[in-house]
Every structure is written in structure tokens, then in C-alpha cells.
Interface confidence: medium
């Protein structure tokens, strides 16, 4: 299944309501408005695939379609990270990868997409209706998350068709900077368009499959209620999840990801901002001014960091870009 957050569709002005201004006069404002909406709306896609060879083995692929520099990717299951979801893997461009069972292999596929293979055996194996979520933290867009799952009727070996229920979330800390300025500009542009008496207010019509209306909705205060509208988490079969996930995770083990930030609009003030924080029993992303600390609950890794090189035969340098140039 490939669930993609759609850019809101713009409804063009009705031909009968052209008014005093000629059609060409409106081209620039509409182009600007289109750019505003699309530029302010990074997209995250999630694809969940059940392998034909191993019926209980899953491959989750996630990608970020924004233009910013990705500073952290978190993959979770059972719901969004911080909303009852349990972390499967954390990928950081400089510090590396950490993963926990049943994750078998997490890897960067490109500069902006990752994949995760899940083990298909034992109590911790996923099942078809499990929800998998990918959260991308980037600068300047902030933090964006999308979720997806395989419908129970999916044929093994096939990706499910796009579902209409991805979660797309921007953490406030990440978008109040550059994205906030962009949003203000877009709102102002809308205001200018409204002032033309002979023009109806431009209608922003969300795409049918999009949970996200105009940009402002992305950081609506009630993220939990937003999420509830989009993904029916009540249908998750919790028996597919390991029982150990509901218990407090032991401390110790890999240290770096417990205090990993996602990129916020504000730079950390100094080393103190990155001091390790107590690890809660459940995974959560805590938004603070200096950054977003990944506080997914620590568990003893079964397979350790699942580190696999970029698939390009030329090696990592083939992935040159904002993160990869030596």
C-alpha cells in the first residue's frame, strides 16, 4: 500500500465570474497561491508490503517529498509515534541507525526515503491490519508523519492500493520558523484576493484522499482528534504486537537515540540542550523549544542497528546531495 498525502486541490474561479479584471491578470496570484499551498505542504508517503515468500514478513517503505534536510526518521507501529505507537527503528544521517525487534533491517534507500523489513515469526510478528507510521523530521518543514497498513484481504507479494487515511502532522516547533512566514504570506495573498469585490474567495478544496486541508490545518492544536478522524486505530489487532511492549522497557543499551532531536526551527542552545532525558515506558516525541527529543522507549535490540548501505552500485557517494557530498 502506498498512502500519499495529497496537496490540496485548487478550485479555479468560475468562468462566469471573471469580473472587471482580465483572466491574465489573475495568472500570477493563482500561480503564487498554488506555490504557497504546495511549498508549505511537504508530503510523506508510506508503503506497506507483505512479502510473497514469507507471509508474515513485511516491508515498510517511507519517503519524504519536502525539500528540507532530513534530520531524523522514526518508524513505529500500532499508531503514530507518541500516540501509543511503538518505535521500530530510528535513523539519523550522522549518528546511524537503531532498530528493535521485530525490525530486521532498516536502511536509507535514498537521501529522503527509507525502508524497513520486519521479521515474520514469533509473538512480535506483525499482522495484516497493523498500522505502520513514518515520521520525518526535517528543516525547515518541521516534523511530518504518515501512516499506513495492509488491508486484511491483500494478496501476499502485492502492495496495497493507496488508502485515503495517511496522517500528516507538523510539530509546531518545526514550522513556526520559515514555514510560518510562508503561511503568513499565503494567508496575506488570500486576503488580497478576497478584496477584489467581483471575485469570489478562492476555494481550497482538499483532495479526496487528503486528511489535510490548507496548511493551517497541519498544525491544528488537536492532533489527537485529527488523527482519530483519519485512521481507525480501534481496529488494530493488538494481539499482533509483542506483549513486552506494554511493559516498562529496561534502561541502558544504545544511548544516542534516547536524546535525539528532530530538527526544530530553533537551534539548540548548547550541549545542555541535548542531555539525555529519562526514557518513558512508551515511545513519545516531546516537543520543546530547543528541538524535538526522540524518547521512544528503550528495549534490548534483538538485531542491533540494522545498517545497510545505499543500494546504488556506486556506493554512498552516488547519493550526493545536501547530506552526502564529501
Amino acid at each position: 500500500m502506498r498512502t500519499e498525502a495529497q496537496v490540496p486541490a485548487l478550485q479555479p474561479p468560475e468562468p462566469g465570474l471573471e469580473g472587471a479584471m482580465g483572466h491574465r491578470t489573475l495568472v500570477l496570484p493563482w500561480v503564487l497561491l498554488t506555490l504557497c499551498v504546495t511549498a508549505g505542504t511537504p508530503e510523506v508517503w508510506v508503503q506497506v508490503r507483505m512479502e510473497a515468500t514469507e507471509l508474515s514478513s513485511f516491508t515498510i517503505r517511507c519517503g519524504f517529498l519536502g525539500s528540507g534536510s532530513i534530520s531524523l526518521v522514526t518508524v513505529s507501529w500500532g499508531g503514530p509515534n507518541g500516540a501509543g505507537g511503538t518505535t521500530l527503528a530510528v535513523l539519523h544521517p550522522e549518528r546511524g541507525i537503531r532498530q528493535w525487534a521485530p525490525a530486521r533491517q532498516a536502511r536509507w534507500e535514498t537521501q529522503s526515503s527509507i525502508s524497513l523489513i520486519l521479521e515474520g515469526s514469533g509473538a512480535s510478528s506483525p499482522c495484516a491490519n497493523t498500522t505502520f507510521c513514518c515520521k520525518f523530521a526535517s528543516f525547515p518543514e518541521g516534523s511530518w508523519e504518515a501512516c499506513g497498513s495492509l488491508p486484511p484481504s491483500s494478496d501476499p507479494g502485492l502492495s496495497a492500493p493507496p488508502t485515503p487515511a495517511p496522517i500528516l502532522r507538523a510539530d509546531l516547533a518545526g514550522i513556526l520558523g520559515v514555514s510560518g512566514v510562508l503561511l503568513f504570506g499565503c494567508v496575506y495573498l488570500l486576503h488580497l484576493l478576497r478584496r477584489h469585490k467581483h471575485r469570489p474567495a478562492p476555494r481550497l478544496q482538499p483532495s479526496r484522499t487528503s486528511p489535510q486541508a490548507p496548511r493551517a490545518r497541519a498544525w491544528a492544536p488537536s492532533q489527537a482528534s485529527q488523527a482519530a478522524l483519519h485512521v481507525p486505530y480501534a481496529t488494530i489487532n493488538t494481539s499482533c504486537r509483542p506483549a513486552t511492549l506494554d511493559t516498562a522497557h529496561p534502561h541502558g543499551g544504545p544511548s544516542w537515540w534516547a536524546s535525539l532531536p528532530t530538527h526544530a526551527a530553533h537551534r539548540p542552545q548548547g550541549p545542555a540542550a541535548w542531555a539525555s532525558t529519562p526514557i518513558p515506558a512508551r515511545g513519545s516525541f516531546v516537543s520543546v523549544e530547543n528541538g524535538l527529543y526522540a524518547q521512544a522507549g528503550e528495549r534490548p535490540p534483538h538485531t542491533g542497528p540494522g545498517l545497510t548501505l545505499f543500494p546504488d552500485p556506486r556506493g554512498p557517494r552516488a547519493m550526493e546531495g545536501p547530506l552526502g557530498v564529501r
Epitope: R267, G304, V325
Partner: antibody
């Protein structure tokens, strides 16, 4: 030419402090994480810690044995990385190296300084 | 932390010999392993990154292989300047090194 030059090493008493500098040249300093390593006499290499690149907010991380005592920082305007060492112990005696990277964690540390010797002794 | 175990700790070889050094990780690190060469009184030099990618400027007689937990550094034909100590290092923080393999002249 891409180059790293360490300085600031010397003889210091246990419990005292010392600050090492790593001056970078020949590359865009802010684009790279900077790492510190050490090597005790006749021993192998040990990672001390690192400070992330500008793109990742300059986050720091340390090996367990120095956490709380050592602090890594960077001055982008001067292209210098620092290793502030407090509460020094005799077991901190080593040659300290700074290294460029990792730019991405898969790449390794591709440029190293010549090293500076720190001797902690009473 | 991930432990890296190198073997042998030392070996004696002659110019022209094929030399193989192994490194084992305490848990899977996929292909994220680097190899360094260090000569007495000098800083380490990166030879191989990501298990098998040759660092720019490093002679092609050096090669790396392996994935998961077992890795190998091979010098196809040992040259006089290759007598040194070699270290493996895994790439996710906290970074850890193998104990080193000293290649000496037979």
C-alpha cells in the same frame, strides 16, 4: 588542502582541566560533524565523542567514560572544534586526535589531525 | 555498545603476500564498517568505508568485504609501506573499534 591541526595538549595534574583545539582548513567546516578520538600509549583507538554538523544543530555525543567531564563545541566563524576536558584522570592520558566526519555515518572519518599528547600525572 | 573483535592481533608477512584480517561485530551492523591503517606516531588513515568501498586515493590492492557480523580486509599483494596496524570500526554511535591487527615484516 584539507587539513586539521590539533593544539592544546600538555602535562596536567589529575582533577585539572585542559582545552584542546582542532583548527580546520580547506573545506566547509559547518558541513561536517567533527569527532574526537584518543589513543593511550601502546593501546588501540577509542572514540571520545563528536559534534554534529550545522545542518543537525551541532548536537554532541560522548563515550560513557568521559560523559559529564568532557565537552565538545565548535566555532564556525573560526573553523575550530574544541574538546574541553575537566576533572582529568590519569587514564585520560593519550594522544588525542580530531577527525572530520562523519558527513554521513556510513562514510567514516576521512581526514585526521596529527594528534596532540595529553599527559595526566601528579 | 557494539563490540568489535579483530583477528589476528598480529601477523608476520612478506612483501607480495596476500594478507587477510577479519573483524567480527557483537551484533549485526549490516555493511556499516570502516577500516583504518595507522603507522607508528601517525594518525589513522581511512582505507575502506561501508565494508567494501575504497576510499579515494587508497591503492586498489586493499579491499573489504562482508556484512552483518563478519568482515574482512584483504591486501592482495603486501607492499613495504603496508606494514602498519589496521583497525576496523563500526559506524553507529557510540563508535567502537576493533583491537587492531599489527602487520609486521616476516
Amino acid at each position: 588542502e584539507v587539513q586539521l591541526v590539533e593544539s592544546g595538549g600538555g602535562l596536567v595534574q589529575p582533577g585539572r582541566s585542559l582545552r584542546l583545539s582542532c583548527t580546520a582548513s580547506g573545506f566547509t567546516f559547518g558541513d561536517y560533524a567533527m569527532s574526537w578520538f584518543r589513543q593511550a600509549p601502546g593501546k588501540g583507538l577509542e572514540w571520545v565523542g563528536f559534534i554534529g554538523s550545522k545542518a543537525y544543530g551541532g548536537t554532541t555525543e560522548y563515550t560513557a567514560s568521559v560523559k559529564g567531564r568532557f565537552t565538545i563545541s565548535r566555532d564556525g566563524s573560526k573553523s575550530i572544534a574544541y574538546l574541553q576536558m575537566n576533572s582529568l584522570k590519569t587514564e585520560d592520558t593519550a594522544v588525542y586526535y580530531c577527525a572530520r566526519g562523519p558527513r554521513r555515518y556510513t562514510y567514516g572519518m576521512d581526514v585526521w589531525g596529527q594528534g596532540t599528547t595529553v599527559t595526566v600525572s601528579s | 555498545d557494539i563490540q568489535m573483535t579483530q583477528s589476528p592481533s598480529s601477523l608476520s608477512a612478506s612483501v607480495g603476500d596476500r594478507v587477510t584480517i577479519t573483524c567480527r561485530a557483537s551484533q549485526s551492523i549490516s555493511s556499516y564498517l570502516n577500516w583504518y591503517q595507522q603507522k607508528p606516531g601517525k594518525a589513522p588513515k581511512l582505507l575502506i568505508y561501508a565494508a567494501s568501498s575504497l576510499q579515494s586515493g587508497v591503492p586498489s590492492r586493499f579491499s573489504g568485504s562482508g556484512s552483518g557480523t563478519d568482515f574482512t580486509l584483504t591486501i592482495s599483494s603486501l607492499q613495504p609501506e603496508d606494514f602498519a596496524t589496521y583497525y576496523c570500526q563500526q559506524s553507529s554511535t557510540p563508535l567502537t573499534f576493533g583491537g587492531g591487527t599489527k602487520v609486521e615484516i616476516k
